[in-house]
Structure formats: structure tokens, C-alpha cells
Amino acid sequence: LEETLLNTKLETADLKWVTFPQVDGQWEELSGLDEEQHSVRTYEVCDVQRAPGQAHWLRTGWVPRRGAVHVYATLRFTMLECLSLPRAGRSCKETFTVFYYESDADTATALTPAWMENPYIKVDTVAAEHLTRKRPGAEATGKVNVKTLRLGPLSKAGFYLAFQDQGACMALLSLHLFYKKCAQLTVNLTRFPETVPRELVVPVAGSCVVDAVPAPGPSPSLYCREDGQWAEQPVTGCSCAPGFEAAEGNTKCRACAQGTFKPLSGEGSCQPCPANSHSNTIGSAVCQCRVGYFRARTDPRGAPCTTPPSAPRSVVSRLNGSSLHLEWSAPLESGGREDLTYALRCRECRPGGSCAPCGGDLTFDPGPRDLVEPWVVVRGLRPDFTYTFEVTALNGVSSLATGPVPFEPVNVTTDREVPPAVSDIRVTRSSPSSLSLAWAVPRAPSGAVLDYEVKYHEKGAEGPSSVRFLKTSENRAELRGLKRGASYLVQVRARSEAGYGPFGQEHHSQTQLDESEGWREQLA
């Protein structure tokens, strides 16, 4: 980037620069016409017959340097070819010399500083690349010369530029004084300010653009070179904050549009809101869940929103005495999550009708909650109780939802308790064809024993047709029509209002071989 200190092309009034000495043939200010056909102020000198060593000086006004250390001067000039000038002496030149003089204020006069090299500092002797020439019988032709010189290093508040002619026929068409600065640059979301280089290279600290944050590592910096160019080097720049994405060639951060989000700082663009979420404002780092949808505390900010599952389906119960096997089908709606578990709530109602949460005497296998498989075994059910089990499905966001948790209920009523198995069978009498048996009355929990059933068969005759039954209302029985000297296996069960109890253990008895032995009591 170039910052202009003086551009004669833009001057409309007379320049009124100072010339020395005040003699004929001196630099003269004239109107000229530039490439764009605009009128410009120019200086011309054409004293090609002067005495050797005589110089014509032209000095600009005082130019504040505005902090520049090196200033560039672009000269546009034309010069006549000495060969084309019939009256040109041997002193005719096709060069001129450029000087500068530094001062802290506009202190120069018509005579000071002395018009010589030192105090003036020589910049360069400028030769024309293109000469305007005229050949007899032809039009004069020529081109404009353009030369850029470098002044400095400068240290005072300002300076004058001076031109020394020693026998050229030339015109200074324009003078452009400028310094170079590194233009404000935004790269990798880092803004580097406009910088005037004070040395060959100057380190410049960058700052993050709006809505960007520094990347980890050293703070970003670039080097501004003396020629006004930023030195090419990778920048550990900044990155867009959450809710913003890089735009316009990584020069600014743009807020995520409605319906999109960006959860983290860094590279990457705004993404559409995940399922069941929305963002109603621009610049969202996270999308809000729709009503009824949630993110678990452990879910990433960019995860879809999920909802608690619906109730499990089709609970099937299989009652086996005091044990109950429950199994069910997975819910129709999982809520969009994989972390599905099941839990059971239980209420029990006594035969009399009073109900309460199930007591601690029930055991659940694998447990009453955090079930990952859709089944459970409940043990310790009490007879003649009605149990209500509510099976619920849960997931990682169930705890965030308000309102009732859907469940699938199942009611199970246990049987009233039958008498216990009859044991302690005794043979009170035996004969070759009969056996008299007696047993202790079992303690029936649900009312008195109504009657008994005796099941017996000859040992070794296992088929169903060989088994015989005998009902008795007393706690004794006589088995008749038995084989002589045979072994029999006997079982007894008691019946109450709740039904038959289980058969007791098989009791082994034997009939007599002959009558002579008579009836005799036997203890089982």
C-alpha cells in the first residue's frame, strides 16, 4: 500500500517551487498534458548552451514525512536527445541529479541550505531511457520516462527534494512522493493493523476479528517488510467462536444462521440443528430441544435431542406357586436412544382388600430396576394376594422429563394356600391282602382339611393303570385287595377349600405272607 506525500498530478494551482540561481534558462513552471489528457503542472529546463559547470536547481516545498523512514519518489519526465539539437554545445546532457535535504520545519530559503551536495544528500543521477528526437522532415517523437527512487533513511520531521540540471533539455512532468506501508490485512481470522515499516522487517502482532478467539499457541504475528508487503509466513491465527463460522475467505466470522449451530470454537462450519432441536436466533452454539425432547448431561452439545421411551408392550406373566416370571416386548418408541432400561413398580393387595407397595419379602431377579433384558423373575409371592406390576421403560433422558412415566401394568393373583404334603404315614395293621394306614393331620393355612386322597401301587408296577386312589375323610385308610407278601408304595395328599396339597413322600409298606401271622401293627 502506498501513502502519498505529494503528487503534482493532483495539484491544480501553481507549484511555485524554488529555483536557483535566478537567471535566464532556469527551470520554468508550465502547463502540461498527461496520458489521460488532464492538465498538469510541470517544470521544464532547456539551457543546452550554458557554460560548463553551471547548474540549475529546482527544489520542492517542504514535505512532512508522516512517520515514513524510507520515501519513494516516482518521476515522470521527458528529455530531448542532444543529437537532435543543432545548437547544443558539448555541455548538453541527457541526465539530471536528484537530492534531498531533511529538516524539522520548513526553514529553507532562496539561498539556504547552500545549493550543493552536502548539505543536500544525493539520491541518484537519473538518465533517460527514452529520448525525444527530431529528424529533418519528420515529426518529433518521444516517450515519457518513469523512474522511482528511494530516499532515506529519514529521521527529521520532513524534507525537500531537489533537482539539479547541468545542461539537459527536459521537463519534469510529475513527481509522486509516497511511502510504503503494509495495508491492514486479515488472514486466518486475524487482523493485522496498517503498519509503516521502520526497518527492513517489523514484527506486527495480530488480533482476532470480531467473534473469533485465539488459537492455542503463540499469539499470531506477521512481518511487515520495508517494501510494504507482508512477509509470507504461516499464521497461527484465530478461529471462530462457538456459534460462528469462517466466511469471506477466512477474513471474518459469520453468525450461524437460524436453524444451524456450531458447538465449538475452531474450524468447521455451522451445521443444521440435529433431530428434534432448533435455533431461533443467529449465532447459536447449541440448538434448543423441542418441547418434550432432551439431551442427557453426558450427551454432546451436537447430539440430537431425544425423548423418554413409550411403555413396554405385551407383558406376559407365568405364575408358578410363589414365583412369577414376567416378560415383555420393547416399547414401540425408543425415544431415539440406545440406553434403554426397564424398571418395575409393585403393589400387593391382601385377600381382605387392603393394598400397599410390595414388601421387602419379594425378590426380583436380576433386579427391580436397571434391567437391560425384557424379563424378570419375582419370588416370594404370598398366596391369595393380588399383585399389580407396572413395567416402565427408561432411557438417559427419562429423569429430565416431567409428567407421568408411561407403563404397562399386569395383575397377578396367587392361589390360596393348599395344605402341605402329608408325611409320617404309619401302617397300623397289615394282613396278606390289606394294609391299614394312619397319618398326622397337616396344618392347613386356609381352613380345615376336608378330606384326603391316598395314591398307591405295587412296587415295580409303574404304569398308570396300576395306580389306585382312595378318598377318606379321616386321617386313616384301609387298603384292601392287595397281593400277599407284596411291597406297596403309598402317597397321601390333603384337600382344603384352597384345593389339594401336594402328595407327600412315597411310603414303603408290605403285606403279610399268610394269615397265621395275624394282624399286626407296623410303624412306618
Partner: antibody, heavy 126, light 109 residues
Framework: QVQLVQSGAEVKKPGSSVKVSCKAS????????ISWVRQAPGQGLEWMGK????????DYAQKFQGRVTITADESTSTAYMELSSLRSEDTAVYYC???????????????????WGQGTLVTVSS | DIQMTQSPSSLSASVGDRVTITCRAS??????LNWYQQKPGKAPKLLIY???ILQSGVPSRFSGSGSGTDFTLTISSLQPEDFATYYC???????????FGQGTKVEIK
């Protein structure tokens, strides 16, 4: 402001020559083009030729080639136009005119003439 | 030789009128065309050079346009002091023979 002052009116015989002068006052002279233009009574303008004093040689319109000589004296900032073998149809007002820009200060070789002398009446009559 | 042809050779107009004079070159002269104004008994005065560049001090009611072979001088609102003869001239060919057009006389209607 530059002024071009021409010499006075002349009455000439056919076959003779006339030399008209044009003195420039104020500033640079050598690098401007000085043109000569004539205007016969009731007629239009007619360009005769021009000179850039620093170069010395002049350029002429084909019509006047061999009959007109244009010169310049840089030391006195004066240009001259001499027309020989005069004929009655050479009776005209003769103007000198200076170009708008010097040969060095224009990007284009414009010969547009923005400064004119007052004119010199040359009458050719026997 | 290059020929410069002006039209019309004369015209009558009133103060305030818009006046247009054309000039045609027999060859392409790019934009190297000048316009002059001359009043009786006076030297010509440069109005426009380079086809469209207004000479310093010339009123802005004068304007020029064109390039190549066809050029126009326009006076947007004729003033009493504008009644004069107008000449076009080419600046392009070397040596520039037949530099001037024959002139257009603008008279009061």
C-alpha cells in the same frame, strides 16, 4: 501571459519575397511549436508550416514547399516566415501561432494553437 | 492529402438555441481534432483540442465529441458573443496539409 507580436503590414510586388517576424514575450520559447497560418480575404484558414525552435528545422505544408522558409532565433525569441515568388493570390493576413504545450510537456504531439499573433496583412500587387 | 469537410457552411440561429457543427476527416485521425472560433478582423481562438478537451477559459456551453473521422462541436445555448465562424483542424498527419476545414459561419436569425 505570453504575447506574440508580429511585424507590420507589407505591400509587395509579384515575384518578390516577404519576411514576417513574430516575437514571443514571456517565458519559454525554444520548445513550443510556432505555426504560420494565412487567411486570404473572405476565405478560410490555411496552415503553412511550423517550427520548434530548439530543433531548428521546420515542417511545411506541401502546397508551400520550396516557396516558404520558417526560421527562429532563440536568443531573441523571434520566429520568421519568408514567402518568395509572391503572387496576387498570396494577398492575405499572415498569423503566427504558438502551440498550447511544449514538445516536452505533452504526452501527445498536439499542435493545437492557443496563442496567436495579431496578424500581418501582406498585399501583393503590381 | 487529408481533407477536412465541415457542415453546414453557414447556419442561422437565435440566442439560446442549441447549435451543432460537424466535421468529417477523409482518414482516421483518432482524436487529434481542434476547434477554433474566429470573429471578423480578429485572430482565431482555440476552443477545444483533442476532440473534447475544453481550452482553459472557454465557457462550458461549448463541447466537442467524436473520434476517428466524425466529430461534432456543440454550443448548448447560443449566446450573442458566439456569432462567429468556426473551424475544425486536424493535428494527426505529418506534415499536416489541408489542416483546416472550410469553416462554418453562425449568423443571427
Amino acid at each position: 501571459q505570453v504575447q506574440l507580436v508580429q511585424s507590420g503590414a507589407e505591400v509587395k510586388k509579384p515575384g518578390s519575397s516577404v519576411k514576417v517576424s513574430c516575437k514571443a514575450s514571456g517565458g519559454t520559447f525554444s520548445t513550443y511549436a510556432i505555426s504560420w497560418v494565412r487567411q486570404a480575404p473572405g476565405q478560410g484558414l490555411e496552415w503553412m508550416g511550423k517550427i520548434i525552435p530548439i530543433f531548428g528545422d521546420a515542417d511545411y505544408a506541401q502546397k508551400f514547399q520550396g516557396r516558404v522558409t520558417i526560421t527562429a532565433d532563440e536568443s531573441t525569441s523571434t520566429a520568421y516566415m519568408e514567402l518568395s515568388s509572391l503572387r496576387s493570390e498570396d494577398t492575405a493576413v499572415y498569423y503566427c501561432a504558438r502551440s498550447s504545450y511544449t514538445i516536452l510537456t505533452t504526452y501527445y504531439n498536439y499542435n493545437a494553437m492557443d496563442n496567436w499573433g495579431q496578424g500581418t496583412l501582406v498585399t501583393v500587387s503590381s | 492529402d487529408i481533407q477536412m469537410t465541415q457542415s453546414p457552411s453557414s447556419l442561422s440561429a437565435s440566442v439560446g438555441d442549441r447549435v451543432t457543427i460537424t466535421c468529417r476527416a477523409s482518414q482516421n485521425i483518432n482524436n487529434f481534432l481542434n476547434w477554433y472560433q474566429q470573429k471578423p478582423g480578429k485572430a482565431p481562438k482555440l476552443l477545444i483540442y483533442g476532440s473534447s478537451i475544453l481550452q482553459s477559459g472557454v465557457p462550458s456551453r461549448f463541447s466537442g465529441s467524436g473520434s476517428g473521422t466524425d466529430f461534432t462541436l456543440t454550443i448548448s445555448s447560443l449566446q450573442p458573443e458566439d456569432f462567429a465562424t468556426y473551424y475544425c483542424s486536424q493535428d494527426h498527419f505529418y506534415p499536416p496539409s489541408g489542416t483546416f476545414g472550410q469553416g462554418t459561419k453562425v449568423e443571427i436569425k
